[in-house]
C-alpha cells in the first residue's frame, strides 16, 4: 500500500480468482484513543472499533472511503483505491490503446517546436467518475523539472454506439534550450482513477522525435503569364522555432485533383515557394517537416486552384 | 530521406553542401545498422544516449545562434570570443562566429572518425561479417574536415590487444551512430545558419 495523495491510498493486488488479497491496517488520524468506530462509504454498519482497523482487501467491495468516528463526529477519512495486477501485468482498463505508432500506446505526445513545450493526449470510453493527474520530468534518476497543467476533456467523438473521450494536457520543460541535443528523454506519467480503480500510464520520448510543425501559413497562388503554371508561396508557421535559418523546414507541395483517385503531383523543396501546374478543380496543398531531423510532417495547408 | 530536393547553388557557403552529405550518410548508415542488427538493442528507445564529445567539445554552446543567446537555458558553458580562421569562414563577416564553433565541429568529426575507424577494424575481424561502416560515411567525414581546414594534432587510432567482444562492439556502433546523427543535425543547422548570415 502507498499514499497517492493526502488520505488517498493505493492497494496493489494480484488479481485472480480466490486471491488472498492484501492485509491493510488503517489508523485514525486523531489524538483520541477510545470510543472510535469505523464505517465504509455511506453504510452505517460498524466495521470495527479502536484507533486502528485491520482489513483484508480482496476486491472493489473492500475499497472505498473508510471513516473513523467518535460519538457521531467524523475524525478522519482514508480512501482506498485498487491497482490490479493480472498475470504480472498492471491493468490498463481505463485508457484505450491508440495502437499508433505501435501497440500498447496509451499516451501520445506532440510538440510544435523545440521550445520544450509539448501536448499529450489519451482516449477513454469512460465518461463519469474519472480523474487524471499528470507529472513529467526530464530523465528519471536525477529528474529535471517539467511543469504540466491540468488534464482537460479536449474532444468527444461518437464511435458506433459508444462515445470516445479525448483528454489532453500541456507541459513545459522548465529550462529548455531549443538548440540543445537531448540525451535524457522526457518522462510523462499519468495517474488515472475511475471510481475505486487506480492505473498509471507512462510515455518516454525525446522532443526531437515528437516534433510536428503547424501547417505552413499564408499559402498563396500567383498565376504566371501565358502559362498554366502558378507560383505557390507560403511562410513558416508562427509557432515554429526561430531563427528559421537554424531551425529550417523542408516542404512538400502537392497538386490534387477533385477525385481522390487522380494522380497526385508532388514536389519537395527547401524554399518557401514553388512553381506547379494548376489543373482545373484541383487544389494545392503544402506541408512542412524539420529539414534535418525527419519527425512528423505537419497537416496540409490547402488552397483551391481556381 | 529519399526525396527530390533542389541542389545547392555552387557559390554557397562551402561547408553547407558537405554537412548535408554528412547527415544523409550517417542517417543511411544508422538505418542500415538498425535493419542489419534488428535483434540487437539498436533503436533510439533501447540504447543509452552517450556523447563521446561530452566535456571535450562544446559545439552546441559555441555554435549557438545569436537569437538564442538571450535564452538563459542555452548559456551553460558558452564561450564568447570569435572565430578568425578556417576556410569555411571565407568572406563571411558575422558576429555569430564565436570561438570554437567551427573548430569544435572539426574536433567532433575527428573524434568520431577515430572511433569509427577503430570500430571498423574490430568489425572486420567478426567471423559473422555482419556489418561494416559505410566507406562513403567515412569519406564524407573526411571531406567536411578538409573543408573546415583546421590544423590539429592527429589523434592516434586506438588499438586493442584483447579479443574484441563483437556483441558489445555492435551495440557501441548503434550508440555512436545515434549520437553522431544528432550531432550531424546540429552541424547542418549551424552551417545553414552561417550560410544565411
Amino acid at each position: 500500500i502507498w499514499e497517492l495523495k493526502k488520505d488517498v491510498y493505493v492497494v496493489e493486488l494480484d488479481w485472480y480468482p480466490d486471491a488472498p488479497g492484501e492485509m491493510v491496517v488503517l489508523t485514525c488520524d486523531t489524538p483520541e484513543e477510545d470510543g472510535i468506530t469505523w464505517t465504509l462509504d455511506q453504510s452505517s454498519e460498524v466495521l470495527g472499533s479502536g484507533k486502528t482497523l485491520t482489513i483484508q482487501v480482496k476486491e472493489f467491495g473492500d475499497a472505498g472511503q473508510y471513516t473513523c468516528h467518535k460519538g457521531g463526529e467524523v475524525l478522519s477519512h482514508s480512501l482506498l483505491l485498487l491497482h490490479k495486477k493480472e498475470d504480472g501485468i498492471w491493468s490498463t482498463d481505463i485508457l484505450k490503446d491508440q495502437k499508433e505508432p505501435k501497440n500498447k500506446t496509451f499516451l501520445r505526445c506532440e510538440a510544435k517546436n523545440y521550445s520544450g513545450r509539448f501536448t499529450c493526449w489519451w482516449l477513454t470510453t469512460i465518461s463519469t467518475d474519472l480523474t487524471f493527474s499528470v507529472k513529467s520530468s526530464r530523465g528519471s534518476s536525477d529528474p529535471q523539472g517539467v511543469t504540466c497543467g491540468a488534464a482537460t476533456l479536449s474532444a468527444e467523438r461518437v464511435r458506433g454506439d459508444n462515445k470516445e473521450y479525448e483528454y489532453s494536457v500541456e507541459c513545459q520543460e522548465d529550462s529548455a534550450c531549443p538548440a540543445a541535443e537531448e540525451s535524457l528523454p522526457i518522462e510523462v506519467m499519468v495517474d488515472a482513477v475511475h471510481k475505486l480503480k487506480y492505473e498509471n500510464y507512462t510515455s518516454s520520448f525525446f522532443i526531437r522525435d515528437i516534433i510536428k510543425p503547424d501547417p505552413p501559413k499564408n499559402l498563396q497562388l500567383k498565376p504566371l503569364k501565358n502559362s498554366r503554371q502558378v507560383e505557390v508561396s507560403w511562410e513558416y508557421p508562427d509557432t515554429w522555432s526561430t531563427p528559421h535559418s537554424y531551425f529550417s523546414l523542408t516542404f512538400c507541395v502537392q497538386v490534387q485533383g477533385k477525385s481522390k483517385r487522380e494522380k497526385k503531383d508532388r514536389v519537395f523543396t527547401d524554399k518557401t515557394s514553388a512553381t506547379v501546374i494548376c489543373r482545373k478543380n484541383a487544389s494545392i496543398s503544402v506541408r512542412a517537416q524539420d529539414r534535418y531531423y525527419s519527425s512528423s510532417w505537419s497537416e496540409w495547408a490547402s488552397v483551391p486552384c481556381s | 530521406r529519399n526525396l527530390p530536393v533542389a541542389t545547392p547553388d555552387p557559390g554557397m557557403f562551402p561547408c553547407l553542401h558537405h554537412s548535408q552529405n554528412l547527415l544523409r550518410a550517417v542517417s543511411n548508415m544508422l538505418q542500415k545498422a538498425r535493419q542489419t542488427l534488428e535483434f540487437y538493442p539498436c533503436t533510439s528507445e533501447e540504447i543509452d544516449h552517450e556523447d563521446i564529445t561530452k566535456d571535450k567539445t562544446s559545439t552546441v554552446e559555441a555554435c549557438l545562434p545569436l537569437e538564442l543567446t538571450k535564452n538563459e537555458s542555452c548559456l551553460n558553458s558558452r564561450e564568447t570570443s570569435f572565430i578568425t580562421n578556417g576556410s569555411c569562414l571565407a568572406s563571411r563577416k558575422t558576429s555569430f562566429m564565436m570561438a570554437l564553433c567551427l573548430s569544435s565541429i572539426y574536433e567532433d568529426l575527428k573524434m568520431y572518425q577515430v572511433e569509427f575507424k577503430t570500430m571498423n577494424a574490430k568489425l572486420l575481424m567478426d567471423p559473422k561479417r555482419q556489418i561494416f561502416l559505410d566507406q562513403n560515411m567515412l569519406a564524407v567525414i573526411d571531406e567536411l574536415m578538409q573543408a573546415l581546414n583546421f590544423n590539429s594534432e592527429t589523434v592516434p587510432q586506438k588499438s586493442s590487444l584483447e579479443e574484441p567482444d563483437f556483441y558489445k562492439t555492435k551495440i557501441k556502433l548503434c550508440i555512436l551512430l545515434h549520437a553522431f546523427r544528432i550531432r550531424a543535425v546540429t552541424i547542418d543547422r549551424v552551417m545553414s545558419y552561417l550560410n544565411a548570415s
Epitope: 476486491e59 470510453t125 480503480k197 | -
Partner: antibody, heavy 117, light 108 residues
Framework: QSVEESGGRLVTPGTPLTLTCTVS????????MIWVRQAPGEGLEWIGI?????SAYYASWVNGRFTISKTSTTVDLKMTSPTTGDTATYFC??????????????WGPGTLVTVSS | FELTQTPSSVEAAVGGTVTIKCQAS??????LAWYQQKPGQPPKLLIY???KLATGVPSRFSGSGSGTQFTLTISDLECADAATYYC???????????FGGGTKVVVV
C-alpha cells in the same frame, strides 16, 4: 429523504410532456439522479442520469427524444415528441452519493404516462 | 453494452434456494446492483458493489462476482421473496446504467 414523480397523464403522439421529480430532505447538488421507465408487463429501462454537477447522460436509444435538467429541488424529464411506444410508468431515483458513482437507493412511486391517439 | 440475466423465471419452494445470474458484455469490475420489484411498486435496492448488502436487507440475500459474471443468491426462501429481480450496472454513464431483463421468482 424522499423523491416523487409527477406530470404523468394521457397525451396524444407528438405532444411534448415534462415529468417532474421533486426531492426533499437532501440537496441535488450532492447526488446523481436517474430516470427509469417500465412499460406495462415489461422490465426496467434506463433513460438517463443527471450528475451532481449537472451533466446529463442518456441511454444510446434516446437519440434526443428525452432531455433531463434540474433546478435546486426538482429534476425534469422532457419528452420531446412522445410515441405510443413511450407508454410506461416513469420512475425517478436518487444515487447513493458515495465517493464513487451510484447505485440507486431511494425511488419514487412512479408516474404513468399513456401515449395514445 | 448489455446485461444478460438468467433465468427469466424460476420457481422454488419455501425454505429453498434460488440463484440468479447476470452477465455483462464487458468488464464492469464490481459496479453492479441488484433490485427487487413487486407488482405496483418501485424497485428496492438489495445489493450494491456486487456483494454488499443494502441497509435493512436480510442476510438471506447475497451477491457475488466481479468483472463480467455476477450472481444473486436467495436462501431460506420466504413467500415475501416472490418478486422480479433485476441487476443493474453503474460502471459508467457511457457504457450505460442499464438493467438486466429481470428474473421472476415464484415461491411455492
Amino acid at each position: 429523504q424522499s423523491v416523487e414523480e409527477s406530470g404523468g397523464r394521457l397525451v396524444t403522439p407528438g405532444t411534448p410532456l415534462t415529468l417532474t421529480c421533486t426531492v426533499s430532505g437532501f440537496s441535488l447538488s450532492s447526488y446523481t439522479m436517474i430516470w427509469v421507465r417500465q412499460a406495462p408487463g415489461e422490465g426496467l429501462e434506463w433513460i438517463g442520469i443527471i450528475s451532481a454537477g449537472g451533466s446529463a447522460y442518456y441511454a444510446s436509444w434516446v437519440n434526443g427524444r428525452f432531455t433531463i435538467s434540474k433546478t435546486s429541488t426538482t429534476v425534469d424529464l422532457k419528452m420531446t415528441s412522445p410515441t405510443t411506444g413511450d407508454t410506461a410508468t416513469y420512475f425517478c431515483a436518487r444515487g447513493s452519493g458515495t465517493y464513487t458513482s451510484d447505485y440507486f437507493n431511494i425511488w419514487g412511486p412512479g408516474t404513468l404516462v399513456t401515449v395514445s391517439s | 453494452f448489455e446485461l444478460t440475466q438468467t433465468p427469466s423465471s424460476v420457481e422454488a419452494a419455501v425454505g429453498g434456494t434460488v440463484t440468479i445470474k447476470c452477465q455483462a458484455s464487458q468488464s464492469i469490475d464490481s459496479w453492479l446492483a441488484w433490485y427487487q420489484q413487486k407488482p405496483g411498486q418501485p424497485p428496492k435496492l438489495l445489493i450494491y458493489s456486487a456483494s454488499k448488502l443494502a441497509t435493512g436487507v436480510p442476510s438471506r440475500f447475497s451477491g457475488s462476482g466481479s468483472g463480467t459474471q455476477f450472481t444473486l443468491t436467495i436462501s431460506d426462501l420466504e413467500c415475501a421473496d416472490a418478486a422480479t429481480y433485476y441487476c443493474q450496472s453503474y460502471y459508467d454513464a457511457n457504457a450505460g446504467y442499464g438493467f438486466g431483463g429481470g428474473t421472476k421468482v415464484v415461491v411455492v
